[in-house]
């Protein structure tokens, strides 16, 4: 009996430019003889419904149709037919199929590969054209993929134990697509510093599929009109 097992859940998520290993494990009732077996990896893009051969291994012959694609012969001996793709790109997302032949048996498995890019975030203070005691803080998130992103603003006053989400005076612009396929977006917070308590911490919170925990950039309102510093951008609430 010949069986192939892919990533549990049927989906693998990998960061852009990463050296990704797409898992494929072979289960066979006898020890594997790699000289008399074949492995073929196929890829089907998200945009075209056409399957393309990525890598092929047959006995003493192996060929990478995608530059750098490799299946380790040493790992194959122990049933690991995982495909390694260096420097994965956004357009390489899609369905990958691992086909194993141990004559006369054949088994296959598929997995969806999602390529994500994590946003970089920075805070900017824009005082151009603003009234007295009025500041506009801009939170720029750039280089992320996929397009779906959630940007919120929070404040934490001195007195209360938890942060408060700010919904008023927040404008988040449209996402802009970059040449490399990633996206940028800017969210703005308008603050009247004269109405806020000194010591209040404000932060821009970015949530995205590529992030395990939200990305935060913050600043503390001082008695004087505020200017951002690098330390404040990375400081915790503490």
């Amino acid at each position: 009996d010949l069986k192939v097992e892919m990533m549990a859940g049927g989906t693998q998520i990998t960061p852009l430019n990463d050296n990704v290993t797409i898992f494929c494990n072979i289960f066979y009732s006898q020890p594997l003889n790699i000289t008399s077996m074949g492995i073929t990896w196929f890829w089907k893009s998200l945009t075209f419904d056409k399957e393309v051969k990525v890598f092929e291994f047959f006995g003493d012959h192996q060929e990478a149709f995608r530059p750098g694609a490799i299946v380790s012969p040493w790992r194959l001996k122990s049933g690991d037919a995982s495909l390694r793709l260096p420097g994965i790109q956004l357009e390489e997302a899609g369905e990958y199929r691992c086909e194993v032949v141990v004559t006369p048996l054949k088994a296959q498995g598929t997995v969806q590969l999602e390529v994500v890019a994590s946003p970089a975030s920075r805070l900017l203070l824009d005082q151009v054209g603003m009234k007295e005691n009025e500041d506009k803080y801009m939170c720029e998130s750039s280089g992320f993929y996929p397009e779906a992103i959630n940007i919120t603003w929070e404040k934490q006053t001195q007195k209360f134990p938890h942060p408060i989400e700010i919904s008023e005076d927040v404008i988040t612009g449209p996402t802009i697509k970059n040449m490399d396929g990633t996206f940028n977006v800017t969210s703005c917070l308008k603050l009247n510093s004269s109405q806020e308590d000194p010591g209040t911490v404000y932060q821009c919170v970015v949530r995205h599929a590529s992030l395990h925990t939200p990305l935060r950039s913050n600043f503390t309102l001082t008695a004087a009109r505020h200017s951002l510093s690098e330390t404040e951008k990375t400081d915790n609430f503490s």
């Epitope: 001195q158 007195k159 134990p161 938890h162 408060i164 939200p214 915790n236 609430f237 503490s238």
Partner: antibody, heavy 117, light 107 residues
Amino acid sequence: QVQLVQSGAEVKKPGASVKVSCKASGYTFTNYWMNWMRQAPGQGLEWMGGIYLSGDSTDYNEKFKGRVTMTVDTSTSTVYMELSSLRSEDTAVYYCTRRGDYFGDFWGQGTLVTVSS
Amino acid sequence: DIQMTQSPSSLSASVGDRVTITCKASQNVGKYVAWYQQKPGKAPKSLIYSASNRYDGVPSRFSGSGSGTDFTLTISSLQPEDFTTYYCQQYISYPLTFGAGTKLEIK
């Protein structure tokens, strides 16, 4: 990292007073507001009051006004909560707490105060 | 003072179950609600703030929802370490007030 270390357990007689301390470390002490909570055995949580650590502002729960006093010693980064005219229903674990960071608010380990004749 | 009415006061469930705890505020508190977990003999640990935002490090099986007066804490798939007591708290105004707690027990 932020740490709030409270004084040890106390046993008091009804009518007496108790003073619980909370020593803070790991952050700029005076920039914060410290709350005090209590929890009677097997019961819920109750806010008693708070103090701004620069020492210029307090806010007490009406229920405890006249019996509770919160003070600060900035030289030792310590906050004190004194409760007077103790009665048996004041038997509880007393906690100092401070506003948090991304992982939540900070709490001391708690101080058990037992009021018994 | 704002009253926070939490229900149920106790709840029996099994590992893997989905459970929901509710909290009702006596007046509109917006989204200014936090949820705590407290293990015996320990200080409470905050899980959720602003009604639905998880603190970093809190497992994704914990989620909060609601605004105004009605709030819920949901644990999507109970783990052995989740069987303990949970409290809601309003922080829109002083005095800060808590729900009476929900004790989650193994069935």
